[in-house]
């Protein structure tokens, strides 16, 4: 193949690959017709003048995962056909000015995972056809104005995993064709107003894992084509009312891991394409009416691991397509009976790890398609009569780790659970907390005999059986939402003497090993 160096492999398709620790310089002679050259995992420490002079047809050059720390300015001379150049995963601290001069066809330049301390406008001034520039994983502390001014065709710019503490509002102003901008894992504390105004074609903006505390109200107002906005793991404590108002194409928004304390009504919207909204790990304490009302197509709403203690009855208005609602690990004590009324398509609701002490009888009244309900680790003592009767698709119900009060009032629930045991899972079953003499006994096993001295023996109402569908898919624990409202008495008062008999054959009921939470 026109003279392949012994340290390399050359294919008929004009592809050359040179790998191995024994290589300490660019191998020679390289086949003159090579179109793709890869130099990987070698001990090359520097590139001298014109090592690729005789392979002017080269289209792709990958020099990755080497010990490369120094490059002579003329190293890439005579590579006018080169479209793809990767110098990723080396030890470069400095780029010589003029290094990319003459690379008139270059479309992709990968400089990621080096030790670059700075870039200058002169570095990329010759790269007018560049479409992709990868600078992530370096040690850049600032980007000077003009650094990207000549890259008018750029569509993808990755500056993630650097040490940027601030961004000039002018640095991206000429990048009208940019579609992807990644600034994740830096040390940005704020983004100046106007920074993204020139990015009219931007589709993805990644700002996660910075230290951003405040978002300017009009920060995204010119980014009408934005589809993915990542703001998670910052220090954002509040959202300006209009900050998301001009993002009609948005289909992914992450805000988890911030310090949000409240969400104002209409803050999200209109976003007809948004399918998922991740708000876990914030400090949200309440949800007002209509806070999500513009998110008509939302299917997943994750609000777990906040401090939510109050949910307004109309908080979930408009979420007619919602499939999964996660409210677990909050501080909910009460839920209004109508709070989930609009969620006609809800399949999975997570309310575990809250402080719910009771649930209203109509809490799931209009949510007929529920398949999974997580209610474990609350403070429920009983549940209202018939609360699950209409949930024909329910195949997973988690009720363990609640302080169930196993007096005569528990009979309807106990009877329903007996008939619907497969839904409860096998590893953990609900156990009684009170009275003390039955503490720890399975709520399903326990036998409550009600002795009535009078001739008239009232019929004990039981939860009607809901058939269990074994072919319905089982959903894993996801997230939880919790809150309660008025306590609906599950059965009529029993004034008679109650005696409780207990069976202790726990192994029959799968109580040998508790499932970890």
């Amino acid at each position: 193949y026109h003279g392949c160096p012994s340290e390399c492999t050359c294919s008929r398709a004009s592809q050359v690959e040179c790998t191995g620790a024994r290589i300490v310089a660019v191998p020679t002679p390289l086949p003159w017709n090579a179109m793709s050259l890869q130099i990987l995992n070698t001990h090359i420490t520097e590139l001298n003048e014109s090592p690729f002079l005789n392979i002017s047809a080269l289209i792709a050059l990958r020099i990755e995962k080497n010990e490369l720390s120094r490059i002579t300015p003329g190293a890439f001379r005579n590579l006018g056909s080169l479209r793809y150049l990767s110098l990723a995963n080396n030890k470069l601290q400095v780029l010589p000015i003029g290094l990319f001069q003459g690379l008139d066809s270059l479309e992709s330049l990968l400089l990621s995972s080096n030790q670059l301390l700075q870039i200058q406008p002169a570095h990329f001034s010759q790269c007018s056809n560049l479409k992709e520039l990868q600078l992530h994983g370096n040690h850049l502390e600032y980007i000077p104005d003009g650094a990207f001014d000549h890259l008018v065709g750029l569509t993808k710019l990755n500056l993630g995993k650097n040490s940027l503490t601030h961004i000039s509002p002018r640095v991206f102003q000429h990048l009208g064709n940019l579609q992807v901008l990644r600034l994740y894992e830096n040390r940005l504390t704020d983004i100046p107003m106007g920074t993204f105004d020139g990015l009219v074609n931007l589709q993805e903006l990644a700002l996660q894992q910075n230290q951003i505390g405040l978002l300017s109200p009009g920060l995204f107002h010119n980014n009408h084509n934005l589809q993915r906005l990542y703001l998670s793991n910052n220090h954002i404590s509040q959202l300006p009312p209009s900050v998301f108002m001009q993002l009609p194409q948005l289909n992914r928004l992450t805000l988890f891991g911030n310090s949000l304390k409240e969400l104002s009504p209409g803050i999200f919207g209109p976003m007809p394409n948004l399918r998922e909204l991740w708000l876990y790990d914030n400090h949200i304490s309440s949800l007002p009416d209509n806070v999500f009302s513009n998110l008509r197509q939302l299917q997943v709403l994750i609000l777990s691991r906040n401090q939510i203690s109050f949910i307004s009855p109309g908080a979930f208005n408009g979420l007619t397509e919602l499939r999964e609602l996660s409210l677990h690990t909050n501080a909910l004590q009460d839920l209004d009976g109508n709070v989930f009324r609009m969620l006609a398509n809800l399949q999975n609701i997570s309310l575990q790890n809250n402080r719910l002490r009771q649930l209203p009888g109509n809490i799931f009244a209009n949510v007929n398609g529920l398949m999974a309900i997580q209610l474990q680790n609350n403070q429920l003592e009983n549940l209202p009569l018939g609360i699950f009767d209409h949930l024909g698709k329910l195949c997973e119900l988690r009720l363990y780790d609640n302080p169930w009060r196993c007096d005569s009032d528990i009979l309807p629930l106990r009877n329903w659970l007996l008939l619907n045991q497969p839904r409860l899972g096998t590893d953990t079953v609900p156990v009684c907390f009170s009275p003390a003499n039955v503490r720890g006994q399975s709520l399903i096993i326990i036998n409550v005999n009600v002795a009535v001295p009078s001739v008239h023996v009232p019929e004990v109402p039981s939860y009607p059986e809901t058939p269990w569908y074994p072919d319905t898919p089982s959903y894993p624990d996801t997230t939880s939402v919790s809150s309660t409202t008025e306590l609906t008495s599950p059965v009529e008062d029993y004034t008679d003497l109650t005696t409780i008999q207990v069976t202790d054959d726990r192994s029959v009921w799968g109580m040998t090993q508790a499932q970890s939470g």
Epitope: R355, D401, T428, Q441, Q513
Partner: antibody, heavy 120, light 112 residues
């Protein structure tokens, strides 16, 4: 007879981790929750967390990132794992349960405690 | 988190006299549906583990002498020892469980 016995305390270097055990007898961990509470010398009580019968856990929010409570039902043992220890974690560590009380978060049976000292 | 503030820090009372300890919560501990105040009182004698005395603000734990009583609702609570005995010398703690538990700073009761 209900008993809770803590072990695993001792001297730990700052930045290190500890794993305390609470061996219980007289009741089953599949039926009762177990809390961890600590008390620095001459100071007040601080609730750390709880593991319930079914394995769910709750933690003190200020310590959550450094705490893990787990258990082995078959061994009748509950564990407290704490990472990134600092001098302020020096304390007596107790485990406790709700044996008779009607208060779900009440702690009416306590161990005698195990002392943890964080110092270089 | 709910902050529990006890007063006084220490209290010296003559044998047979009444001792009163106050506990104030930063948030109401009354659940309007269950109509319970989620407040408990613990006693810790020198060198011993704590002991649960009272829960739901006023319900005495079984075996606790009736000289101990709890009162209050919402954010203000009181533990009263109607006739102090020598064996009551201890530190007393209030604890809320409306949210995840937090203890008060403690009140030391001594004999005058």
């Amino acid at each position: 007879e209900v008993q809770l016995v803590e072990s695993g305390g001792g001297l730990v270097q700052p930045g290190g981790s500890l794993r305390l055990s609470c061996a219980v007898s007289g009741f089953s961990l599949t039926s009762y929750g177990v809390h961890w509470v600590r008390q620095a010398t001459g100071k007040g009580l601080e609730w750390l967390g709880v593991i319930w019968a079914g394995g769910s856990t709750n933690y003190n929010s200020a310590l959550m990132s450094r705490l893990t409570i787990s258990k082995e039902n078959a061994k009748s043992s509950v564990y407290l794992q704490m990472n990134s220890l600092r001098a302020g974690d020096t304390a007596m560590y107790y485990c406790a349960t709700h044996m008779i009380t009607e208060d779900y978060y009440g702690m009416d049976y306590w161990g005698q405690g195990t002392t943890v000292t964080v110092s270089s | 988190d709910i902050v529990m503030t006890q007063s006084p820090d220490s209290l010296a009372v003559s044998l047979g006299e009444r001792a009163t300890i106050n506990c104030k919560s930063s948030h109401s501990l009354l659940n309007s549906r269950t109509r319970k105040n989620y407040l408990a009182w613990y006693q810790q004698k020198p060198g011993q583990s704590p002991k649960l005395l009272i829960y739901w603000a006023s319900t005495r734990e079984s075996g606790v002498p009736d000289r101990f009583s709890g009162s209050g609702s919402g954010t203000d609570f009181t533990l009263t020892i109607s006739s102090l005995q020598a064996e009551d010398v201890a530190v007393y703690y209030c604890k809320q469980s409306y949210n995840l538990p937090t203890f008060g700073g403690g009140t030391k009761v001594e004999i005058k």
